[in-house]
């Protein structure tokens, strides 16, 4: 297994429909065909995984469909997207790229972004 | 809250095997930085052996090396130490300790822990 650097950006924030988008960016040493991306979430001592993906490179990011994230990917880069995001899923949500073939196998995984979540105000009743 | 409890210690001859495990109760260790100490009689605690979160790196103390052996054990939520080639000295507590460190240092063993276990008793002697 080799190392392998992945970038993406320290903060987002979500928006008020609870989606937040963030790109994650990977230096492939060579010439992958097949890549697995996970998106990972560390929150109060525990890692737990949001979602994974694994595409051929070329194609289009599939994940299953009961997924809260959804993403495109165009060489070296993935655009993930999360949704159905409230306050209590505020956290480190961190992008982990597998290069799983040809060998070797590469990992990589990125210092996170914090994506910050704020559930919006309800509405006032309205007289009209 | 997560607890880390220590298994597979006892009694065994020097030249034999042991096989240590340490669990989580109440969370996972995924990508835990997991360490392995141990204290003998009238000494201080020392650590043998860690393995970094993403499980790439293990580091060990020269009294073990070659002969102790650290993974882990994902499916069964655990981190394992592989005992061989038992001699006297080997002798003691042998303590779990973990930290979750920022994704940075996943490839990476903590310079120090969080989270200790209770210990569980190595005795090698014939």
């Known amino acids: 297994c080799k190392a392998m650097h992945v970038a993406q950006p320290a903060v987002v924030l979500a928006s008020s429909r609870g989606i937040a988008s963030f790109v994650c960016e990977y230096a492939s040493p060579g010439k992958a065909t097949e890549v697995r991306v996970t998106v990972l979430r560390q929150a109060d001592s525990q890692v737990t995984e949001v979602c994974a993906a694994t595409y051929m490179m070329g194609n289009e990011l599939t994940f299953l469909d009961d997924s809260i994230c959804t993403g495109t990917s165009s060489g070296n880069q993935v655009n993930l997207t999360i949704q159905g995001l409230r306050a209590m899923d505020t956290g480190l949500y961190i992008c982990k790229v597998e290069l799983m073939y040809p060998p070797p196998y590469y990992l990589g995984i990125g210092n996170g972004t914090q994506i910050y979540v704020i559930d919006p105000e309800p509405c006032p009743d309205s007289d009209f | 809250e997560v607890q880390l409890v220590e298994s597979g210690g006892g009694l065994v001859q020097p030249g034999g095997s042991l096989r240590l495990s340490c669990a989580a109760s109440g969370g996972t260790l995924d990508y835990w930085s997991i360490g392995w100490f141990r204290q003998a009689p009238g000494k201080e605690r020392e650590e043998v052996s860690c393995i970094s979160g993403t499980g790439l790196r293990t580091n060990y103390a020269d009294s073990v090396k070659g002969r102790f052996t650290v993974s882990r054990d994902n499916s069964k939520n655990s981190v394992i130490l592989q005992m061989n080639s038992l001699r006297a000295e080997d002798t003691g507590v042998y303590y779990c300790?973990?930290?979750?460190?920022?994704?940075?240092?996943?490839?990476?063993?903590?310079?120090?822990?969080?989270?200790w276990g209770q210990g569980t008793q190595v005795t090698v002697s014939s």
């Open positions: 300790t973990g930290k979750l460190l920022h994704p940075s240092l996943w490839s990476a063993c903590a310079n120090e822990y969080d989270l």
